[in-house]
């Protein structure tokens, strides 16, 4: 998977009046990494692992970047002409990626009230607009404003892309990101499905990096893809990931099935709990994390695009 840095900024308005603050989160390799703390007026790391990435360096550069971007986005929202009465949001998502072959990609997306209306591939300088008439109007409105702003030239976007990649490379220099390995905790549960059948679920949690193999095996052989159901690999808010896989088996045949997990060159197998036992937890060198994600968008009542 490529390394990525994603900036997620939102500004709000009420009856056309744009609020003076902004909401911002930055994700590094898909993990919550920074957020802008309005009360402290600066970018703050999300949890211990994010603090470790920069060590004792300050977050002044990140604060400056987010503040500047927030100001730009507020100005953009103020120039959206068709603002109706009530609460509205303008969200900008900027992503830059470095792939294994050292190639780079960068994109930018704008959402109004949760609806995507404008995207840009920075390398190709190609803008994309969805077909809806609302998106077309909004996109024209915003693009005209961006063109009027001398800063929003091609060089501006390329500089923004270069800055994003420079930041990403700076973070990747940290051994915390490149060499970080947190083994998963694997957890097998069973539940009655229908007469004679049970559903067995294997959950892996608190692991890093994201890549993991989790599959059910019968007599040591992996089950076919269509007999298993997989959950997405999702951030758990602690700088680590979680996922699951489930399958349906005949009651009484539990001992033939194991959950196979492979992560960062290590692997383990986990049996189905038998009889009345509902949960078997296999603590596989599990490292505990106590840094929960403080979700600043909880109270915002606006659609939030990951």
């Amino acid at each position: 998977e490529p390394h990525s840095l994603r900036y997620n900024l939102t500004v709000l308005s009420w009856d056309g009046s744009v609020q003076s603050g902004f909401l911002a989160e930055v994700h590094l390799d898909g993990q919550p990494f920074l957020r802008y703390d309005r009360q402290k007026c600066r970018a703050k790391p999300q949890g211990q692992w994010a603090e470790d990435v920069l060590g004792n360096k300050t977050w002044d550069r990140e604060t400056r970047d987010l503040t500047g971007n927030g100001k730009d986005l507020r100005m953009t929202l103020a120039h959206i002409k068709d603002q109706k009465e009530g609460l509205h949001s303008l969200q900008e998502i900027r992503v830059c990626e470095i792939h294994e072959d050292n190639s780079t990609r960068s994109s930018q997306h704008f959402y109004y009230d949760g609806e995507l209306f404008l995207s840009q591939n920075v390398e190709t300088e190609e803008w994309t607009v969805p077909q809806s008439s609302r998106a077309q109007t909004l996109a024209m409105n915003v693009r005209n404003f961006l063109k009027e702003d001398a800063m929003k030239t091609k060089t501006h976007y390329h500089a923004m892309h270069a800055d994003c990649l420079q930041e990403l490379r700076r973070y990747l220099e940290s051994s915390v990101v490149l060499r970080r390995r947190v083994p998963p905790m694997v957890n097998v549960t069973r539940s009655e499905a229908s007469e004679g059948n049970i559903t067995v679920t294997c959950r892996a949690s608190s692991f890093y990096p994201r890549n993991i193999t989790l599959t059910w095996r019968q007599d040591g052989v992996s089950l076919s893809h269509d007999t298993q159901q997989w959950g997405d690999v999702l951030p758990d808010g602690n700088g680590t990931y979680q996922t699951w896989v489930a399958t349906r088996i005949c009651q009484g045949e539990e001992q033939r099935f194991t959950c196979y997990m492979e992560h960062s060159g290590n692997h383990s197998t986990h049996p189905v709990p038998s009889g009345k036992v509902l949960v078997l937890q296999s603590h596989w060198q599990h490292h505990h994390h106590h840094h929960g994600l403080n979700d600043i968008f909880e109270a915002q009542k606006i659609e939030w695009h990951e």
Epitope: L12, W14, D15, S17, V18, Q19, S20, G21, D37, R38, Q39, K40, C41, R42, D60, T63, G86, L87, A299, Q300, K301
Partner: antibody, heavy 116, light 107 residues
Amino acid sequence: EVQLEESGPGLVKPSQSLSLTCTVTGYSITSDYAWNWIRQFPGNKLEWMGYISYSGSTNYNPSLKSRISITRDTSKNQFFLQLNSVITEDTATYYCARGGTYFDYWGQGTTLTVSS
Amino acid sequence: DIVLTQTTSYLSVSLGGRVTIACKASAHINNWLAWYQQKPGNAPRLLISDATSLETGVPSRFSGSGSGKDYTLSITSLQTEDVATYYCQHYWSTPWTFGGGTKLEIK
């Protein structure tokens, strides 16, 4: 523990300038947060006047913009309020407080009377 | 500027009783509201931020609620030390403004 303390002249004549100092202990004003001036009029109405952020940027209440200036001395961990051309209606208790949105630490306040 | 209106200037409540203090904003403020308690001769003290988040050290008999334009501070089981004036303050956009205050007395 974070502590803020205001100091000032107590009495100022109309049309003169008012200068107040807020001394912060237990926290560096260059670390983070915004550092605010808030006043409370004799009828108890509270008014936010403006702030200087940890980075040195300022934000003022538009109703005072032409008369107000907030500065700081980082070596002494102090920030200052200057209000020009004062009038009797500027008579109030002046507070300094910490916060970029709401105010979690306040000074005890200093009373200022504008009178000839 | 956003105007915060605390319609009740004075409230007289019995000890042990329940109090609700209202604050209405002239615009939607997205829960960006704080509540303060001020006792005579003292500076205001922060009780609640983000409309509902109780500050450390504030007794759990205090709570905040509301959304959009309408917000409420509630005090259950009123104590003598709760006699004070209560102010709301928004931080949707600058200039930040305060409500006019609600003075709470014991009946």
